[in-house]
């Protein structure tokens, strides 16, 4: 749905959420370009790009929540993701630097699409919560009460270490979106609302 507007059609909204999570679990849209841009595309370096345990809720945890609790957790987690993506973007090379070093400008464009995509997903999460009559959900543009702080990177002056932390975060993000997608695919069909 467009930012700020909510579809009242359950299956269309769920379809949008399913589509968005399908795309966001695809590593070719975020992790892979990040690895290439940051010069980590070497087998020995890729080995160090492992997901940090506990950075994102597990699929088991998500499955244990009711629909409303799941949406609230997803909303809060996406808030953290937005903060972290903003931090990652600040440390990306500029377009002209990429061209000079022979790297693909499309990779940078993919990384820059990540935050708008997360905002779009978060808007639809908010819309779905509204559709489920969840009055506790904060609007996607505002900070939620009790929203956990984004996972803070280890303070370090080591540029290489920061790149690896970014890589680990993105790996966890894709895995988390895969879990979210699996849960949305299980939501299946609500009571038939089609005869409006």
């Amino acid at each position: 749905a467009a930012m700020g507007s909510c579809s009242k059609e359950y299956r269309m909204l769920l379809g949008q959420l399913q589509k968005q999570t399908d795309l966001m679990q695809d590593t070719s849209r975020l992790l892979d370009p990040y690895i290439r841009i940051q010069g980590l595309d070497i087998p020995k370096l890729r080995e160090h790009c492992r997901e940090s345990p506990g950075a994102f809720p597990s699929e088991e945890t998500l499955r244990g929540l009711g629909r409303r609790g799941f949406l609230q957790t997803l909303n809060a987690t996406l808030g953290c993701v937005l903060h972290r993506l903003a931090d990652l973007e600040q440390h990306l090379p500029k377009a002209q630097d990429l061209e000079r070093s022979g790297l693909n400008i499309e990779d940078l464009e993919k990384l820059q699409m990540a935050r708008p995509n997360v905002l779009g997903l978060r808007n639809n999460v908010y819309c779905m919560a509204q559709l489920l009559d969840n009055s506790d959900m904060t609007e996607p543009t505002k900070a939620g009460r009790g929203t956990p702080q984004p996972p803070t990177p280890t303070p370090t002056s080591d540029v290489f270490q920061r790149k690896l932390e970014g890589c680990s975060f993105l790996r966890g993000y894709h895995r988390f979106m895969h879990s979210v997608g699996r849960i949305f695919s299980k939501w299946g069909e609500s009571p038939n609302r089609s005869r409006r």
């Epitope: 749905a1 467009a2 507007s5 299956r11 269309m12 379809g15 589509k19 069909e189 038939n192 089609s194």
Partner: antibody, heavy 120, light 106 residues
Framework: QVQLVESGGGVVQPGRSLRLSCAAS????????VHWVRQAPGKGLEWVAV???????DYNAAFMSRLTISKDNSKNTLYLQMNSLRAEDTAVYYC??????????????WGRGTLVTVSS | EIVLTQSPATLSLSPGERATLSCSGS?????MYWYQQKPGQAPRLLIE???NLASGIPARFSGSGSGTDYTLTISNLEPEDFAVYYC?????????FGQGTKLEIK
């Protein structure tokens, strides 16, 4: 290979009814949503209705009161029952498949279509 | 409902040239889909999720855009590319199509 074949079109008088069929092969209607999309002669495409894998349905509000979409999973066949037909319902009616088991409202496989002509 | 307006209505080009087809929405949409239709045939999916090539579609086709403005580009026109092209959205109910752009041989 995945295929959709429509049938049941023809010439019908205004006010009468018609039932279109769409036989699916190469995939199961229990795994995918299938839509009806129509195209008036020389005009663009217009989404009509969908029946999802679990049997729930959605209709274009513009003419939903006169339409019923249904399916027979055992025959792997989709139907569109059209009542109180009008001249403006004259069109080629296509059935078209959603690309996966989720609620995706776009179409990766289309049938060849069946022409419905409403005329006295 | 979201109205999709395609431009131009007709585009006359020669094989080997580059075609740029536009689709503008009355409201913002998340993703755009593009179909090709030849006379007497069913539509065929070309582009899904704004920029992803559908299965079996040659790489000369590409899609881009966001918000209300989307573009289908055919980089090096082949004789078989001359057809009618439709954009489609499903970000808002009901799913809607543009009125089509006819790509004809100059």
């Amino acid at each position: 290979q995945v295929q959709l074949v429509e049938s049941g079109g023809g010439v019908v008088q205004p006010g009468r009814s018609l039932r279109l069929s769409c036989a699916a092969s190469g995939f199961s209607l229990t795994n995918y949503g299938v839509h009806w999309v129509r195209q008036a002669p020389g005009k663009g495409l217009e989404w009509v209705a969908v029946i999802w894998r679990g049997g729930s349905t959605d209709y274009n509000a513009a003419f939903m009161s006169r339409l019923t979409i249904s399916k027979d999973n055992s025959k792997n066949t989709l139907y569109l029952q059209m009542n109180s037909l009008r001249a403006e319902d004259t069109a080629v009616y296509y059935c078209a498949k959603s690309p996966n088991s989720n609620f995706y409202w776009y179409f990766d496989v289309w049938g060849r279509g069946t022409l419905v002509t409403v005329s006295s | 409902e979201i109205v999709l307006t395609q431009s131009p209505a007709t585009l006359s080009l020669s094989p080997g040239e580059r075609a740029t087809l536009s689709c503008s929405g009355s409201s913002s949409v998340s993703y755009m889909y593009w179909y090709q239709q030849k006379p007497g045939q069913a539509p065929r999916l070309l582009i899904e999720d704004t920029s992803n090539l559908a299965s079996g579609i040659p790489a000369r086709f590409s899609g881009s855009g966001s918000g209300t403005d989307y573009t289908l580009t055919i980089s090096n026109l082949e004789p078989e590319d001359f057809a009618v092209y439709y954009c489609q959205q499903w970000s808002s109910y009901p799913p809607t199509f543009g009125q089509g752009t006819k790509l004809e041989i100059k």
